[in-house]
Structures are given as structure tokens and as C-alpha cells.
């Protein structure tokens, strides 16, 4: 989880730094949103609990052609210990509702901010 080199620095990044950078990227997305994010694309909502990073990536990786979230997709892949490809859903990922990408990003951001405040960096 600490091997996130290439996003902001040349070497391994401490988990706290990686999480802060992911939060900053999500803040950037929400603040710079003029038109509907990813043109209103809908993705599976996720349970913001164990396996959250992989589940978030599994959901967002299906959206292609949306440059606004490409960096987020790359950053999430650094938090997920296994390779994720489009159309792949783990047993942790319960497909019960789809939401717009914009709402997905807002929900994820709120949860990550909470984790950061509580010092849960992994």
C-alpha cells in the first residue's frame, strides 16, 4: 500500500501522504465541476467499509473517456493490492444501486476525509 511512487514523488509515498493526495484530487474534481461530471455517467455505489479502495476502483474503472477521473483511477489502483480491470466485481461489491459519478466522488471524499481525521491511512 505504500508503494505509490509516480503520483507526486519519485520514491515510495507514506500512506498518509498518498491518502492526502487522493483527497486533494477528489476536492479538485468537485470544486472544478462545471458540467455534470463524466457527462452524468452512472456507476455502482459501494459499501464504504473493508475493501473500499478496490471496490471504488472496480466501480470507477468502467467509466472510460472521462479525463476528469483518470488521475483518481490511477491513484486508487495504488491502494488496491490486486489488479482491477473493467467489468470485474469482487464479492465485497454488492450491486444494489447506481449513482452518478459526481455523487460517487462526493460520498468517497467525505468518507476519506473522515478516515484521514481518524488517522486510518491504510
Amino acid at each position: 500500500l505504500t508503494c505509490l511512487g509516480g503520483f507526486a514523488s519519485p520514491g515510495p509515498v507514506p500512506p498518509s501522504t498518498a491518502l492526502r493526495e487522493l483527497i486533494e484530487e477528489l476536492v479538485n474534481i468537485t470544486q472544478n465541476q462545471k458540467a455534470p461530471l463524466c457527462n452524468g455517467s452512472m456507476v455502482w455505489s459501494i459499501n464504504l467499509t473493508a475493501g473500499m479502495y478496490c471496490a471504488a476502483l472496480e466501480s470507477l474503472i468502467n467509466v472510460s473517456g472521462c479525463s476528469a477521473i483518470e488521475k483518481t483511477q490511477r491513484m486508487l489502483s495504488g491502494f488496491c493490492p490486486h489488479k482491477v480491470s473493467a467489468g470485474q466485481f469482487s464479492s465485497l461489491h454488492v450491486r444494489d444501486t447506481k449513482i452518478e459519478v459526481a455523487q460517487f466522488v462526493k460520498d468517497l471524499l467525505l468518507h476519506l476525509k473522515k478516515l484521514f481525521r481518524e488517522g486510518q491511512f491504510n
Partner: nanobody, 116 residues
């Protein structure tokens, strides 16, 4: 180029039924996950249902579970939504969508009005 055209909407009384269709072209329909999404007057988008490419997986919003049925005919490149026991709150424009694509790829939608 992805093209989707919905049909089958109309005015129906509460408790009635409608079957929506969506003709798809411009992409490989039989490997595409497909959605039905709706937008009520003055409201945001609401996901309704999803069907997997193989037809094995069908998923529904709680608000329509047990009343709506999504299906597809891959030989005809057509997506369907059978809507039973319709309620006033089902009034909306219904869009079919190739999953994970933005609104610019959706069809014009079909208006469903449930009223007595």
C-alpha cells in the same frame, strides 16, 4: 457511434402497465451492460435497472423492485422494460443507456405519465 432510441411511453392510469423498448446501434450490443435511468419533472437522474450482457444479472432500484422487469433481445439489439403496477411517482422521462456512458450517448428518452 452509439445510438439509442426509446419508445413505448405514454399516459397510463395508476395500476396500469407499459412496456418500453430501446433500439440500439453503433456498438456491440450483446457484450454491453445496459441501464434504464429516469428523470422525473424537476428532479435529478434516478437509476432504475441494469442488465448484464449475458442476461444472467438483473438489478433494480428498491423503488421499482417487484414491479419492473428488465430484459434484452441480443438478436434484435433491443432492450426492454416491462413496467407493471405503475404509480404516480413513476412519472418521468425514461432513458436507456449503455452502462458507464454519459448523457451525450443516451437516447432522447420516452415520457411515461401515470395519472388518473
Amino acid at each position: 457511434e452509439v445510438q439509442l432510441l426509446e419508445s413505448g411511453g405514454g399516459l397510463v392510469q395508476p395500476g396500469g402497465s407499459l412496456r418500453l423498448s430501446c433500439a440500439a446501434s453503433g456498438f456491440t450490443f450483446d457484450v454491453a451492460e445496459m441501464d434504464w435511468v429516469r428523470q422525473a419533472p424537476g428532479k435529478g437522474l434516478e437509476w432504475v435497472s441494469t442488465i448484464s450482457p449475458s442476461r444472467r444479472g438483473t438489478y433494480y432500484a428498491d423503488s421499482v423492485k417487484g414491479r419492473f422487469t428488465i430484459s434484452r433481445d441480443n438478436s434484435k439489439n433491443t432492450l426492454y422494460l416491462q413496467m407493471n403496477s405503475l404509480r404516480a411517482e413513476d412519472t418521468a422521462v425514461y432513458y436507456c443507456a449503455k452502462a458507464y456512458t454519459g448523457r451525450s450517448w443516451w437516447g432522447p428518452g420516452t415520457l411515461v405519465t401515470v395519472s388518473s
